[in-house]
């Protein structure tokens, strides 16, 4: 038969709210050498016990009796700390447990979640959360919205998860949690509410250098707007755009525009060249959400300034044309030149010469076309850009007005009419 | 001595349950936790939970909890295990064993098989 | 859960070897315990709070360790010592087992 128990004082019962400190006590009366005291909870030794151990004689030779007395100290009571507490010694080839104690945990509620502060655009749904554990049990929670109830009493409105189907004005909100014990308030959240995202951003008019965008706002609840902010980045690199990133791989150009209206001229920007925009509405509570970046794209301008460096000479019946790309910008891709030349008292004639950079003209006749000048212009798909001024070709045999032919076999006539002001003609009888 | 003694094996149908009895002997019954292990064929040892007879509470193994049920009678120094809905798969020896922050003795076992 | 590693599986020790069985636990814990199970036998204890020898126990058997690695030695193997060894932890929930390590004599 088993051994009288060694123990001749068990721990007690610590019940009480978290933080709580207390303290737990074993003793028990051996014969010889202490042994070790362990401690259980719920059946398994405590390996980080903040325990100590009290060894004291009771008599003047080794092997008569001691008393042991261990004390298990719970700082900041925990609920991980609750359950059924032992004593624990091995006495030579027996082991000893003391009776139980017990320790609980009772209080106010515990919040293990509580409403966050958030943003949210005005009109739209979101959740709220809040839990919160006693001991004792039940919890119940109450909602509050801008510090009024949101049912009638604890437990008959939403627990765990509030529902809000959407605010126009900024809210707060907090939940009581009620048990047996009493009521804990958790923590006040605000929520914001922002202006709804921008709908329906779109180019309204398109320019070579500029772009004429308008958007539709979203709702704003009770706040007007003040105005929007208007991002432009190129795209030809933007792969981050495209891959749908949130932020533009360079920093974008930013506009604001005043509301109303709902609209926008961006300027200085690059002809022929791809952006991506994007909108957001800002009110006195913050701005909203960006809308998705829209690739747009400026159109192609006519070039800016004329070919450069025109030369024309004459070697008998031919004549030599050539000049360079021009310095000004050319506001698109160059599709050719146009190039015009005409006699003093000849009609003027218009050649098509493509991308090439030079012509030679073939002036039929051995007589000499007096005063005989040649204009160029280069062109992209949006038109001509300006004319040069008129280049002269001295009279090769003053006096002789022969008809002037091309040698290449561009059509004479234009193959579109040419506003009359691009050309300069500048000659008399 | 401590001793612990297992009722006889057992044979059951899928979807049925068994009950495994462990009778203590040798010291306090209700001062030492029993806890129940098992060990299906050729396997290692799986614990499945433990009862305190002092007040009857249980703790189980989230694996076999819903499952698991276990008891114990102080009059006549027994612990209960029950296992319902068996599986093919439960088949196994079933030990009890006293804990004292580990299992320092064990009963012989009792092999249950779940077959159809 | 805490996971224990056995190392070896298997192994084939003539008697009066030195024979060391170690458990390498997934995390840190404070104690660990082993068992002996013989063929068609239950489990027994062997080594308690990781050193202490359990009540019976010849004094051939020794555990030592710290952390996440401990050992099993026994110190000139004998017969009776075919067995399958394992290690177990309870520093946390669940208890967990090692898959054992299963000692031939040869």
């Known amino acids: 038969q088993a051994e009288e128990s060694p123990f001749v004082g068990n721990p007690g019962n610590i019940t009480g709210a978290r933080g709580l400190t207390g303290t737990l006590r074993c003793q028990l009366q051996v014969q010889g050498e202490p042994p070790e005291v362990h401690w259980l909870r719920d059946g398994q030794i405590l390996e980080l016990a903040d325990s100590t151990q009290t060894q004291v004689p009771l008599g003047e030779d080794e092997q008569d009796d001691w008393i042991v007395v261990s004390q298990l100290r719970i700082t900041s009571l925990q609920l991980s700390d609750t359950g059924q507490y032992q004593c624990l010694v091995f006495l030579g080839h027996q082991t000893f447990v003391s009776q139980p104690g017990y320790v609980g945990l009772e209080g106010l509620p515990y919040f293990l979640e509580e409403p966050e502060d958030r943003t949210v655009a005005a009109n739209t749904p979101f959740n709220l959360s809040c839990q919160a554990q006693g001991p004792p049990e039940p919890v119940d929670l109450l909602w509050l919205q801008d510090a009024v109830p949101l049912a009638t009493a604890p437990g008959h409105g939403p627990q765990r998860s509030l529902h809000v189907p959407g605010l126009n004005k900024t809210s707060s909100f907090s939940c009581e949690a009620h048990n047996a014990k009493g009521v804990t308030t958790s923590r006040t959240a605000t929520i914001t509410v922002l202006p709804q995202q921008p709908r329906n951003l779109h180019l309204v008019s398109r320019q070579p250098t500029e772009l004429e965008v308008a958007w539709t706002p979203g709702l704003s609840g009770i706040y007007p707007l003040t105005h929007c902010t208007l991002q432009a980045v190129l795209s030809d690199d933007g792969m981050g755009i495209q891959a749908g990133e949130p932020d533009p791989p360079e920093e974008p150009l930013t506009s604001q525009a005043s509301v109303p209206p709902h609209q926008l001229r961006l300027g200085s920007l690059h002809p022929h060249t791809p952006y991506h925009i994007r909108v957001a509405c800002t009110s006195s509570q913050g701005p909203s959400s960006w809308t998705h970046w829209l690739p747009v794209e400026t159109p192609e301008g006519v070039p800016l300034g004329p070919p450069e460096n025109i030369s024309a000479t004459r070697n008998g019946s031919q004549a030599f044309v050539h000049w360079q790309e021009p310095r000004a910008p050319l506001q698109g891709t160059l599709l050719g030149y146009r190039l015009a030349y005409q006699g003093q008292d000849t009609p003027e004639v218009l050649m098509d010469i493509g991308l090439r950079q030079e012509v030679t003209l073939e002036l039929q006749g051995d007589g000499s076309v007096s005063n005989l000048t040649v204009c160029v212009a280069a062109y992209t798909a949006a038109g001509d850009g300006p004319w040069s001024l008129p280049v002269p070709l001295e009279a090769w045999r003053p006096g002789q007005a022969q008809p002037v032919h091309q040698l290449v076999k561009e059509p004479s006539t234009p193959a579109f009419s040419w506003p009359h002001h691009h050309h300069h003609h500048h000659h008399h009888h | 001595q401590v001793q612990l003694v297992q009722s006889g094996a057992e044979v059951k149908k899928p979807g049925a349950s068994v009950k495994v009895s462990c009778k203590a002997s040798?010291?306090?019954?209700?001062?030492?936790?029993i806890n129940w292990v098992r060990q299906a064929p050729g396997q290692g040892l799986e614990w499945m939970g433990w009862?305190?007879?002092?007040?009857?509470?249980?703790k189980y193994n989230e694996k076999f909890k819903g499952r698991v049920t276990m008891t114990r009678d102080t009059s006549i120094s027994t612990a209960y295990m029950e296992l319902s809905r068996l599986r093919s798969d439960d088949t196994a020896v079933y030990y009890c064993?006293?804990?004292?922050?580990?299992?320092?003795?064990w009963g012989q076992g009792t092999l249950v098989t779940v077959s159809s | 859960e805490i996971v224990l590693t056995q190392s070896p599986d298997f192994q084939s020790v003539t008697p009066k070897e030195k024979v060391t069985i170690t458990c390498s636990a997934s995390?840190?814990?404070?104690?660990m315990y082993w068992y002996q199970q013989k063929p068609d036998q239950s489990p027994k204890s062997l080594i308690y709070l990781t050193s202490n020898l359990a009540s019976g126990v010849p004094s051939r058997f020794s555990g030592s360790g710290s952390g996440t690695d401990y050992t099993l030695t026994i110190n000139s193997l004998e017969a009776e010592d075919a067995a399958t060894y394992y290690c177990?932890?309870?520093?946390?929930?669940?208890?967990?087992f090692g898959q054992g390590t299963k000692l031939e004599i040869k």
């Open positions: 177990q932890q309870w520093s946390s929930n669940p208890p967990t």
């Open positions: 064993a006293r804990s004292t922050g580990f299992f320092d003795y």
């Open positions: 040798g010291y306090p019954f209700t001062d030492f936790y």
């Open positions: 009862i305190y007879p002092g007040s009857g509470n249980t």
């Open positions: 995390s840190s814990i404070g104690y």
